[in-house]
Interface confidence: low
């Protein structure tokens, strides 16, 4: 089979079981809101076992030399049925068997010179990004693992010759801010990337990441925190130079306001990332004084 | 149990080639990253290389670079080290890890296997 | 590369008292930092890692701190068979490396 039709059968392959695996969830919690306002119906069968989530792999993105640094292990995943219920066991490990294939026949061949070469390879590359991000958060360990690495060989594979959109695609799932894992392993791929972005794209990438660090910030998972925590020190790296007084304080409220949460977790992530965030404004001295006045509010 | 068995160290010559295994059982192979470490005798340990979960991703030392390749089946559940081109610096112990929930930190290690490189 | 310096090079101590081992980085490697025990004829044991949380199964003892490039190895109370080589390893950046070991001896 020529490789664009393994390609787009996979894809559609892939596309329709996590279609799937959504509309199940909706009528899940459809079910658990209509429960709430009828009488108990008799005990369903017990879901699976959860699965604790391994973190990002230690492996770096880049070939050399900087390895991302590995986020805490976030709390296990939703016991969430990938399949009904009522289906044989086998049904199920084989399906997770032809999710892993469809990610490995997607990664293998996105980076293949006759892809590659392909006049809708653009659109291709944005529907692997995007799959591989949605297997992230898959219920399946294994698929977890192998999303993650396909993300890492096609970014290592194609960031010489497709960069802007490999940037373009993470950025699009950090925006979506959806599943934590998928919103993580964007994140800290993304903020590895960042230092690449060509100059003139800086001021209108930060323009549009703003919203995004400041509507993360306000998510109640301590994985996403940490993962935020040490992206925004990158993020801030490449674009804070960019960034105008009002920009920067608007983001820095954003993280002051987390020094206020009942997680110590959350609270340290803030107040890295907030010193972070003056560490790389245009005026660093000006921001560290602001940002001590605030906080000396805070005590009084 | 989580079970790592290290194999196929000995004497060689310098300029020789050797190929050292890693049999793992008691855990799910594929979904971690495996490494291998060395101890020289009487010194400190050293880090050799590095392989990623489905393989996709290796790294190494500078000091094994171009001379020893790691890989693994995962089907079979073996990591493998072949290391090529010896020199008396690469005597030592090799030890092969497993990563601890894919964080990078080796919290699994096989007792050894000793490589003695000489003429 | 990072360079990772331990010190002392031998620490020697009484039962009940406390060691303070301390690692050194030549550059900042945040908090990705682990220790490791390694007692002769055994292979190295993971005590702590991200620099200050406690692998499955070590006593509270042992406890990491430090962030950037200093780190420390405190073992509260010493214990005979606390007597062996600990090593501290970055995983900040490629390659990897470890220091040279604190020997830590128990009179």
């Known amino acids: 089979m020529a490789t664009l039709e393994k390609l787009m059968k996979a894809f559609e392959s892939l596309k329709s079981f996590q279609q799937q695996q959504q509309q199940q969830q909706q009528q899940q919690q459809q079910q658990q809101q209509q429960q709430q306002q009828q009488p108990p119906p008799p005990p369903p069968p017990p879901p699976p076992p959860q699965l604790p989530q391994p973190p990002p792999q230690a492996q770096p993105l880049l070939p050399q030399p900087q390895p991302p640094p590995p986020p805490p292990p976030p709390p296990p995943g939703p016991a969430v049925a990938e399949e009904p219920l009522h289906r044989p066991k086998k049904e199920l490990s084989a399906t997770k068997k032809d999710r892993v294939n469809h990610c490995l026949t997607i990664c293998e061949n996105i980076v293949a010179q006759s892809v590659r070469n392909s006049p809708e390879f653009q659109k291709l590359l944005g529907i692997a990004m995007e799959l591989f991000l949605l297997c992230s958060d898959d219920a399946e360990s294994d698929v977890r693992m192998v999303a993650d690495e396909c993300l890492n060989k096609v970014i290592k594979a194609l960031m010489d010759s497709n960069l802007p959109r490999l940037q373009l695609e993470l950025y699009k799932e950090i925006k979506k801010n959806g599943a934590p894992r998928s919103l993580r392993a964007a994140l800290w791929r993304f903020a590895e990337l960042a230092h690449l972005v060509r100059p003139q794209k800086c001021r209108p990438y930060l323009v549009n990441l703003l919203p995004c660090l400041t509507r993360t910030s306000k998510r109640p998972e301590e994985s996403v925190q940490e993962t935020l925590a040490a992206a925004v020190p990158k993020i801030m790296a490449s674009f804070g130079n960019f960034a105008n007084d009002n920009e920067i304080k608007v983001l820095l409220k954003a993280f002051i306001a987390n020094l206020k949460s009942s997680s110590p977790t959350i609270r340290r992530t803030a107040a890295g990332s907030a010193v972070s965030i003056c560490q790389h404004s245009r005026r660093t001295q000006y921001f560290y004084s602001w940002l001590l006045n605030v906080l000396l509010g805070l005590l009084v | 149990e989580v079970q790592l068995v290290e194999t196929g160290g000995g004497f060689v010559q310098p300029g020789g080639s050797l190929r050292l295994s890693c049999a793992a059982s008691g855990f799910n192979f594929g979904s971690y990253a495996m490494s291998w470490v060395r101890q020289a005798p009487g010194k400190g340990l050293e880090w050799v290389s590095d392989?990623?979960?489905?393989?996709?991703?290796?790294y190494y030392a500078d000091s094994v670079k171009g001379r020893f390749t790691i890989s693994r089946d995962n089907s079979d559940n073996t990591l493998y080290l072949d290391m090529s081109s010896l020199r008396a610096e690469d005597t030592a112990r090799y030890y092969c890890a497993k990563d601890r929930k894919r964080s990078g930190w080796y919290e699994q290690w096989g007792q050894g296997t000793l490589v003695t490189v000489s003429s | 590369e990072i360079v990772m310096t331990q010190s002392p090079a031998t620490l020697t101590l009484s039962p009940g008292e406390r060691a303070t081992l301390s690692c050194r980085a030549s550059q900042s490697i945040s908090a990705y930092l682990g220790w490791y025990q390694q007692k002769p004829g055994q292979a190295p044991r993971l005590l702590i890692y991200?620099?200050?949380i406690r692998a499955t199964g070590i006593p509270d003892r042992f406890s990491g701190s430090g962030s950037g490039t200093d780190f420390t190895l405190t073992i509260s109370s010493l214990e005979p068979e606390d007597s062996a080589v600990y090593y501290c390893?970055?995983?900040?950046?490629?390659?990897?490396?470890f220091g040279g070991g604190t020997k830590v001896e128990i009179k």
């Open positions: 392989i990623s979960g489905i393989g996709s991703n290796t």
């Open positions: 390893h970055q995983r900040s950046k490629w390659p990897l490396t």
């Open positions: 991200d620099a200050s």
